[in-house]
Amino acid sequence: PEPPTACREKQYLINSQCCSLCQPGQKLVSDCTEFTETECLPCGESEFLDTWNRETHCHQHKYCDPNLGLRVQQKGTSETDTICTCEEGWHCTSEACESCVLHRSCSPGFGVKQIATGVSDTICEPCPVGFFSNVSSAFEKCHPWTSCETKDLVVQQAGTNKTDVVCGPQDRLRA
């Protein structure tokens, strides 16, 4: 019969022959022959392979280096890599999360639109009219100006995006 030019899924072509790939968590030791199956070997501790493969070496698990602000989010297995994330107050600098940077704070006049996570930075927004923020914070949203009317007071000093209004007593007309 004609030697194959293509192989089924989870197989690979070698020496005009279709050999089985090694399953995730195992690496290739020797290709199949006419008389023998593909020989595979489990990855050792701290190693993984996450696909059907013909790799001769397993990959080493990623190390989540605390010196770079990293911590383990999920421990690796023989079939999965370790997933790193950042310590509280930090976020990853890239999708691969190889290092972390401190969450940005929103300056006075700006509030937090979205709190940072282990993988995304703080998103700030300018405080619109009627709202203010007088602190630099990675958590505080813009606060609404105090409503003097509900306290039976009047505005003595207008608010800004960085300061609240100042309320005071209403001037009473004397008889």
């Epitope: 690496k27 070997l41 050792g44 501790e45 701290s46 080493q60 698990h61 421990k75």
Partner: antibody, heavy 118, light 106 residues
Framework: EVQLVQSGAEVKKPGATVKISCTVS????????IHWVKQAPGKGLEWIGR????????KYDPKFQGKATMTADTSTDTAYMELSSLRSEDTAVYYC???????????WGQGTTVTVSS | QIVLTQSPTIMSASPGEKVIITCSAT?????ILWFQQKPGTSPKLWIY???NLASGVPARFSGSGSGASYSLTISRMEAEDAATYYC?????????FGGGTKLEIK
Amino acid sequence: EVQLVQSGAEVKKPGATVKISCTVSGFNIKDYYIHWVKQAPGKGLEWIGRIDPEDGDTKYDPKFQGKATMTADTSTDTAYMELSSLRSEDTAVYYCTTSYYVGTYGYWGQGTTVTVSS
Amino acid sequence: QIVLTQSPTIMSASPGEKVIITCSATSSVSYILWFQQKPGTSPKLWIYSTSNLASGVPARFSGSGSGASYSLTISRMEAEDAATYYCQQRTFYPYTFGGGTKLEIK
């Protein structure tokens, strides 16, 4: 800085039980396996077993099954190994160590000497 | 269980001499770790994943091998290399150590 600090030396009578500890700093104990290794006086290294502190899963060398019991407390980042029914041949230095890729050092504790003597 | 046999058990080498320590397994393993131990101290990881030098290990050391046959090589022996070296496999439970090779300086 990563450190594994073990409890102090112990002298025990035959038949007694000893529990030694290994407290880690510089990483969360639940993130990596902790291995225990025995070294009898003038002898080589023997692997006793390992624990996954996250879920308590353990693997032992059959030789130490029933002799050693490994546990871990993630709240204090401490691993423990208890040795029961002590005999003179249990006299050794016992080490705790991490999965090898922790910072490519594979950190080891300083060792705990257990002496069994009547 | 996998038995690791180290050879030689004991050897001495002159400064500048090339040293090869072997570690053979009773069946194939994924990788070998090498540890160095000096008297009265804890072992230190020396080579991981068969051929990668651990942090702080001098470049005169190298590791190689695959399957059931591995080796640690020192290109030029130095006095500070005198120690006992152990290989370990972490592929199949129970994990096992070789019996050790005591390397002395002449």
